[in-house]
Interface confidence: medium
Amino acid sequence: APVPPGEDSKDVAAPHRQPLTSSERIDKQIRYILDGISALRKETCNKSNMCESSKEALAENNLNLPKMAEKDGCFQSGFNEETCLVKIITGLLEFEVYLEYLQNRFESSEEQARAVQMSTKVLIQFLQKKAKNLDAITTPDPTTNASLLTKLQAQNQWLQDMTTHLILRSFKEFLQSSLRALRQM
């Protein structure tokens, strides 16, 4: 598994370097998670043909994964820092149950899946410190999450592979949008 941000050899070798700003830490954290997702996607695509699945089949999914929309204020047109930050944090909190689902889905990248999950928790903490309006952030209901997790694990192999592929693809897109938006803040 890759070394978490702040623990790489460059940090150790350069103790007098300026500490990372809050924004730099967040940026680095997201890029670290994206690297992890790439590794997981590689295993998924090697194992099954889901990565070549037609857009039509993917569009049919009923997973309700978090997605950026115009109203969320994260795009350049209509950008709204506060609304966008709330959307990013809320989205990441909603992704947590899906990241939990991924934990049993990898054989050779088991550590990588765990690293993505734990790094996302850290990213949420970073972002919550940055947010002024924490009241606007809705936390997913644990009971709903538990039953969703049970339902996902109760699928057959084909559906589980498709679900894994969709989660990784959607999470990657969500993080990429978040990264672009956070760089404007």
Partner: antibody, heavy 120, light 111 residues
Framework: QVQLQQSGAELAKPGASVKMSCKAS????????MHWIKQRPGQGLEWIGY????????EYNQKFKDKATLTADKSSSTAYMQLSSLTSEDSAVYYC?????????????WGQGTSVNVSS | DIVLTQSPASLAVSLGQRATISCRAS??????????MNWFQQKPGQPPKLLIY???NQGSGVPARFSGSGSGTDFSLNIHPMEEGDAAMYFC?????????FGGGTKLEIK
């Protein structure tokens, strides 16, 4: 060729436990889930659960959650099912079946079945 | 749990004629454009044998006389023309979600 060889018939007393085996050959054991199915004489088929031999991950039909325990031994390419607290309701033929997964899941190869007779 | 209701419970068909068995699911067994419905044939003293998977695809070595159709909640298995060796029990099975369930079975006999 692919074969699933199940252990012989079991005669057990009420309250006892039995452990049956399903030895796989002709394919890579860890690459496919293994299912277990129950069939009572002259009746339909009931899915008990599956095990992923590669990870040991199991999913059970809630009905059999406290009755059956699925395990797998990678070194001998053998799947096992233990049935506990036996009653006359457990008298049945039990099949193991490989879940062949290419693009959809199918139970393509089945064992010959293990007959369990619970009687005092 | 998804309940599968097969009909008829028993059926007698003359050699060379068509046999049609229906299977209705209590909820849709479709997902991502695939119908997760399989059909099995079982003869006395033998394990079930896969005939049709994903509603309409023939299993390996299954004669073209066996065909499957349907989507959502309604499915059917057709055998035409009926042959001597087709007398058996037939089961539908959904594998969309745990617990995987089977229909009650249809006993097909020669008239």
């Amino acid at each position: 060729q692919v074969q699933l060889q199940q252990s012989g018939a079991e005669l057990a007393k009420p309250g006892a436990s039995v452990k049956m085996s399903c030895k796989a050959s002709g394919y890579t054991f860890t690459s496919y889930w293994m299912h277990w199915i129950k069939q009572r004489p002259g009746q339909g088929l009931e899915w008990i659960g599956y095990i992923n031999p590669s990870t040991g991950y199991t999913e059970y039909n809630q009905k059999f959650k406290d009755k059956a325990t699925l395990t797998a031994d990678k070194s001998s390419s053998t799947a096992y099912m233990q049935l506990s607290s036996l009653t006359s309701e457990d008298s049945a033929v039990y099949y193991c079946a490989r879940d062949y997964y290419d693009y959809e899941d199918v139970m393509d190869y089945w064992g010959q079945g293990t007959s369990v007779n619970v009687s005092s | 749990d998804i309940v599968l209701t097969q009909s008829p419970a028993s059926l007698a068909v003359s050699l060379g004629q068509r046999a049609t068995i229906s299977c209705r699911a209590s909820e849709s067994v479709d997902g991502f454009g695939i119908s997760f419905m399989n059909w099995f044939q079982q003869k006395p003293g033998q394990p079930p044998k896969l005939l049709i998977y994903a509603a309409s695809n023939q299993g390996s070595g299954v004669p073209a006389r066996f065909s499957g159709s349907g989507s959502g909640t309604d499915f059917s298995l057709n055998i035409h023309p009926m042959e001597e060796g087709d007398a058996a029990m037939y089961f539908c099975q959904q594998i969309k979600e745990v617990p995987w369930t089977f229909g009650g079975g249809t006993k097909l006999e020669i008239k």
